[in-house]
Interface confidence: low
């Protein structure tokens, strides 16, 4: 390829621009995935207890991919500017590997959507909330995590159970085994609290008097952030893949035209 050709310069410029965008997207993807794995909503214990935290796996891959995309975009820009076949060959090989990882991350994140069902969290809550007789240490750890997370959720977000307070009455649960049904028809966190962290009116709460207990479920507050993050990782990743595909295609064409 003649290096003084203005068309080549223009094509080089386009490829460099494409790689700059890839680099920026890499940084953004890393930032997004770091935000996700930092667990701002403190919901990880609920996912961990389901024995399926693949969405976090997808986010960790996203962090790795984001960093790699940034580094590779720099490599690509150097290769294009120097018109070096060796550098660009390394760029292609590494980019294909990273591309494969990002495809895996996107598929994992996208398919997790169907996993966050009310029944998943309901089953887990009934089995693990205030379950003080687990079969092993790992279960004890998970039970504690689930109990703490639910306590915080119900208090902080003024909700009760997955679908509502009736969850605690309709189904058999560790909580009902541990507590007297008359004294604890649902956890104390379902009661409306005053500034002393006491139920505003315990008897009214136990009787289910409207205004003294929280009658909406917490499902939306759990699934909302998780689904948003999953969609973010999946669709942003997919957008990066689409853009990278065309940049890679262009770079391969450019590579094939570089003189030995």
């Amino acid at each position: 390829m003649a290096k003084d050709n203005s068309t080549v310069r223009c094509f080089q410029g386009l490829l460099i621009f494409g790689n700059v965008i890839i680099g920026c997207c890499g940084i953004a993807l890393t930032a997004e995935c770091i935000f996700f794995v930092s667990d701002q909503h403190s919901l990880y214990p609920l996912l961990e207890a389901t024995d399926n935290d693949d969405i976090y796996g997808a986010a960790w891959i996203g962090i790795f991919v984001g960093i790699c995309l940034f580094c590779l975009s720099v490599l690509g820009i150097v290769g294009i500017m120097k018109s070096s076949r060796k550098i660009l060959l390394a760029y292609f090989i590494l980019m294909f590997i990273v591309y494969a990882f990002e495809v895996a991350s996107c598929i994992t994140a996208a398919t997790q959507q169907d996993f966050f069902t009310p029944n998943l969290f309901l089953k887990q809550m009934l089995e693990r909330y205030q379950n003080n007789s687990p079969p092993n240490n790992d279960d004890q750890w998970k039970n504690n995590g689930v109990t703490k997370t639910w306590d915080r959720l119900m208090l902080q977000d003024n909700c009760c159970g997955v679908n509502g307070p009736s969850d605690w009455q309709k189904y058999t649960s560790a909580f009902r085994t541990e507590n007297n049904d008359a004294d604890y028809p649902w956890p104390r966190q379902c009661c409306v609290m005053n500034n002393l962290k006491e139920p505003l009116n315990l008897e009214a709460c136990k009787l289910g008097v409207p205004g003294f207990y929280h009658n909406q479920g917490c499902y939306e507050l759990i699934s909302g952030p998780m689904n948003r993050h999953a969609w973010g990782v999946a669709w942003f990743g997919f957008a990066i893949l689409c853009w990278t595909f065309w940049v890679l295609l262009g770079t391969m064409f450019y590579w094939s035209r570089i003189e030995y």
Epitope: D151, R188, N195, L196, K197, E198
Partner: antibody
Framework: QITLKESGPGILQPSQTLSLTCSFS??????????VGWIRQPSGKGLEWLAN???????YYNPPLKSRLTVSKDTSKTQVFLKIAHVDTADTATYYC?????????????WGQGTSVTVSS | DIVMTQAAFSNPVTLGTSASISCRSS???????????LYWYLQKPGQSPQLLIY???SLASGVPDRFSSSGSGTDFTLRISRVEAEDVGVYYC?????????FGGGTKLEIK
């Protein structure tokens, strides 16, 4: 049976930071509705509430002292801590920690034996 | 802040007779939920305080039924039906309706 025990430095100088520890047993601060409060009593005087920490890590402080107080907990070690910054002689008192349970409507139902603190130059 | 007011000393009482200790709050401690956020504590000489009464009239566990408490939203009375030697000490009333929690100055029970 429920017990609480306070420990502290005994004597310290003005402008230093007072660090107190309340070690408890017989209840868990990870149980919903549980809290621990700090109260002090200058010799021969009445009781003054300082701070509370609840099971969900919420903290409440006596407003005039708030800027100097920090309460924290270590649930696994069943301990609660109180730090008072920039002490002066007016902080000389016996310091108590007490359990608070929301089932008793905020009553301090179990108290420690107290630890005496003297601020002197 | 809610101010709790108590007399420094009670009228001297004879062992076996009844005694009354009063407490007044600067604001009603009766919450709209029907609960009165008043407590009574006893501090025996050389000991830490102990809870006697919570929620104005509920007896704390382990407290003898010689102790009882009553009152309106702002005026409260602790009664000891048959005073015993072990009842000697300083009685504090306290409130937790509003932060900060506040205690009365304490009333010293005196025996004749």
């Amino acid at each position: 049976q429920i017990t609480l025990k306070e420990s502290g430095p005994g004597i310290l100088q003005p402008s230093q930071t007072l660090s107190l520890t309340c070690s408890f047993s017989g209840f868990s601060l990870s149980t919903s509705g549980m809290g621990v409060g700090w109260i002090r009593q200058p010799s021969g005087k009445g009781l003054e509430w300082l701070a509370n920490i609840w099971w969900n890590d919420d903290q409440y402080y006596n407003p005039p002292l708030k800027s100097r107080l920090t309460v924290s907990k270590d649930t696994s070690k069943t301990q609660v801590f109180l730090k008072i910054a920039h002490v002066d002689t007016a902080d000389t008192a016996t310091y108590y920690c007490a359990r608070i349970y929301s089932g008793n409507y905020g009553a301090m139902d179990y108290w420690g034996q107290g630890t005496s603190v003297t601020v002197s130059s | 802040d809610i101010v709790m007011t108590q007399a420094a000393f009670s009228n001297p009482v004879t062992l076996g007779t009844s005694a009354s200790i009063s407490c007044r709050s600067s604001k009603s401690l009766l919450h709209s939920n029907g609960i009165t956020y008043l407590y009574w504590y006893l501090q025996k000489p050389g000991q830490s305080p102990q809870l006697l009464i919570y929620q104005m009239s509920s007896l704390a566990s382990g407290v003898p039924d010689r102790f009882s408490s009553s009152g309106s939203g702002t005026d409260f009375t602790l009664r000891i039906s048959r005073v015993e030697a072990e009842d000697v000490g300083v009685y504090y009333c306290a409130q937790s309706l509003e932060l900060p929690y506040t205690f009365g100055g304490g009333t010293k029970l005196e025996i004749k």
